[in-house]
Amino acid sequence: VLEVYYTSLRCRCVQESSVFIPRRFIDRIQILPRGNGCPRKEIIVWKKNKSIVCVDPQAEWIQRMMEVLRKRSSSTLPVPVFKRKIP
């Protein structure tokens, strides 16, 4: 399910990781497009062990995963994707 996510006008990620995380260990993914006070796109991953990580948007695995999720967005997703709306 795609939902709108509002956030404050600043970057959320201090550090980014490109290390692969299997989808079964991911609770949800938040995509923050650049703009709204942050000059870069950010991807925040909530994991099933309750930890949170910022993922490098250029990491191949997250790009593949996002593409799969986009293709499946017409049905119920196991990994909800949250997007920030830019006013």
């Epitope: 995380i21 299997p22 119920t76």
Partner: antibody, heavy 121, light 106 residues
Framework: EVQLVESGGGLVQPGGSLKLSCVVS????????MAWVRQTPTKGLEWVAS????????YYRDSVKGRFTVSRNNAKSSLFLQMDSLRSEDTATYYC??????????????WGQGASVIVSS | DIQMTQSPSFLSASVGDRVTISCKAS??????LTWYQQKLGKAPKRLIY???ILQTGIPSRFSGSGSNTDYTLTISSLQPEDFATYFC????????FGAGTKLELK
Amino acid sequence: EVQLVESGGGLVQPGGSLKLSCVVSGFTFSDYYMAWVRQTPTKGLEWVASINYDGGDTYYRDSVKGRFTVSRNNAKSSLFLQMDSLRSEDTATYYCKTEEDYDGSYVMDAWGQGASVIVSS
Amino acid sequence: DIQMTQSPSFLSASVGDRVTISCKASQNINKELTWYQQKLGKAPKRLIYNTNILQTGIPSRFSGSGSNTDYTLTISSLQPEDFATYFCLQQSSLYTFGAGTKLELK
């Protein structure tokens, strides 16, 4: 040849502790997520825990959270499962197995031969 | 948690038969399903992953299909070495195994 060899199983009293080890060879251990899976005649196969490449990320089934700890030593190509506060329902054969590699590929699926854990007074 | 319902629990068949084993998930698992074969006293052996990808070295008489919540393993022509227990595994959210299907010689 890919090999995973478990050790450390045995008989332990309820409330006791046991540490399982899994030594691997034939592939680059640090490239793979690893997991522990257990099996009983009554409950069948159950995932127990998983760990990422460097050991910084761990995941557990609810019934073992706070009692079991999965860890790894990449220099020694070894995976561990520390089991504390053991219960009779933890009695099972415990297998270590490979998961995805660093690129997300799941081409390899290798299992150990299993280690028997019996929790009984 | 995702539950996996596997059927049948027991299956009697003869060499040369075509057999199918089913797994039904409690929610959409997006084809993230694996099939294993296990023989007595041995570790499980992966046959198929991602619903229909045949593991290297597994004979082509094994095939998998399905989508959403319903998945099937088919053995097109049973061989003597195929009599074993078969398990499904969902890997969409953590892990859940099916209870198993014991395939016996009729």
